[in-house]
Amino acid sequence: SSPCPQAWGPPGVQYGQPGRSVKLCCPGVTAGDPVSWFRDGEPKLLQGPDSGLGHELVLAQADSTDEGTYICQTLDGALGGTVTLQLGYPPARPVVSCQAADYENFSCTWSPSQISGLPTRYLTSYRKKTVLGADSQRRSPSTGPWPCPQDPLGAARCVVHGAEFWSQYRINVTEVNPLGASTRLLDVSLQSILRPDPPQGLRVESVPGYPRRLRASWTYPASWPSQPHFLLKFRLQYRPAQHPAWSTVEPAGLEEVITDAVAGLPHAVRVSARDFLDAGTWSTWSPEAWGTPSTGPLQDEIPDWSQGHGQQLEAVVAQEDSPAPARPSLQPDPRPLDHRDPLEQHHHHHHHH
């Protein structure tokens, strides 16, 4: 059997760090057997069998010129094996973030915080967090850990299905390469990361006979459960063409009649969605839909006080809406109140009420 431990990665490749001492191991001999080392294709002896280093070649302070293929030979000239040296860096803790478009599932994505230059894989798992009381500590319910199944198409993403809305989870993403492993932990609560997809099917229609009215209608995003335990609320913005400022209303349902449209001008309309009890954040805006009020026979325009009139927002021209007001919570947000980064690597608690 080979004296060389097989690092994770392609066979025949050994690894080291630039600027560090690197040991190469001759794979086809017995541990301790003296061998001679050569660079592939070069006759110059790098290290002879009398080095006292046995089956190993030591390269002090390796650099990029040392990368390549090496050959080891036994005392009788037989080939002991070929070894390819690749230099790179140990893993660093990956950057991890998690998102949820509904209240039953969430996904986490990751990216390297430093490029190692080496073959790299990621191990992903999660468990449910539980703080045990003294009298309940004798029997802990099943809290995992469980694997977080990764995207079969190779995207840096894993998905947790069937998560509990009220629970908190800890995600573990470990970056592994031949020089080691490094772990990032992240605490996740669906309540805080919930961000619905934008509403779909937005239509804007004129109201015949009402030159200042437009009727907008839309549907729940397809990603929201079809028979939801938790409903969505909506925010609608509209503005006449060439007008810089949006007017905003919060409709009661899946449609809104705008009663202060500018007669004769096309209007842009967009909608956003959020959990109806303010968990998480507002969705991105839907694609804009356009509509122009009717120019037909005039009806008496009686103010319809049952319809919320849009308030003019001062020059809200950014794609994202201004920050939503802080969500009410029965529990404090346990994150630090300042922005210091004490060490390595926290969830918002929110209870629907």
């Epitope: 800890r170 529990q331 346990p334 109140l337 690597q345």
Partner: antibody, heavy 126, light 112 residues
């Protein structure tokens, strides 16, 4: 059954060394933050040391910094406290405790010890 | 890492309420919502009562409640019972060196 069991306490002379161990069972040890807390006879609780799940980061009380080293072996589900240069004021019951901790995208924080061992007595005396 | 300040003792009759304060600084109690409370009976290991300022672990009676204002956290024990006679300690994330800090401890006596 979720359990922590300390061992390694005893009588040691001032300037001496001791290693405490804490065997964990009933939970996935490698996922939890762990710590040591001590209580001198008739006194209050004193936070001693803390270690992250991977063992990569640690924290110490000023009173033990440079003398005590916390470590863990996740393959053995065991937490350790190596104590050097022991002083009379280190005499105490030493508790091993578990913490869920709290991890944001940038940092982890000590939260609360929800499971405690029964304690092991360390006496430093000549 | 100075210990958090608690009153040395507090007392109440069965059925009454008792409140224990825990005063720190903006670097510990005031700066983070990681305040916890522990109960310790003589000769026993401490037990967690409250974590993250207000939350109760499973199995802890709702007679125990926590709160925080500025740099001071409080534990309230309502409907005092004989078995509540014990020492109580607060604890907070300390903000430096990834360190924690305990309070000085309060001995609660149930009268009568």
């Amino acid at each position: 059954e979720v359990q922590l069991l300390e061992s390694g306490g005893g009588l040691v002379q001032p300037g001496g060394s001791l290693r405490l161990s804490c065997a964990a069972s009933g939970f996935t040890f490698s996922w939890y933050f762990m710590g040591w807390v001590r209580q001198a006879p008739g006194k209050g609780l004193e936070w001693v040391s803390y270690i992250y799940p991977s063992g990569g980061s640690t924290g110490y009380a000023d009173s033990v910094k440079g003398r005590f080293t916390i470590s863990r072996d996740n393959s053995k589900n065991t937490l350790y406290l190596q104590m050097h240069s022991l002083r009379a004021e280190d005499t105490a019951v030493y508790y091993c405790a578990r913490d869920e901790g709290y991890c944001s995208s940038t940092s982890c924080y000590f939260d609360a010890f929800d499971i405690w061992g029964q304690g092991t007595m360390v006496t430093v005396s000549s | 890492q100075s210990a958090l300040t608690q009153p040395p003792s507090a007392s109440g009759s069965p059925g009454q309420s008792v409140a224990i304060s825990c005063t720190g600084t903006s670097s510990d109690v005031g700066g983070y919502n990681f305040v916890s409370w522990y109960q310790q009976h003589p000769g026993k290991a401490p037990k967690l009562l409250i974590y993250e300022v207000t939350k109760r672990p499973s199995g802890v009676p709702d007679r125990f409640s926590g709160s925080k204002a500025g740099n001071t956290a409080s534990l309230t024990v309502s409907g005092l019972q004989a078995e509540d006679e014990a020492d109580y300690y607060c604890s907070s994330y300390g903000g430096s060196n990834n360190a924690g800090v305990f309070g000085t401890g309060t001995k609660v006596t149930v009268l009568g």
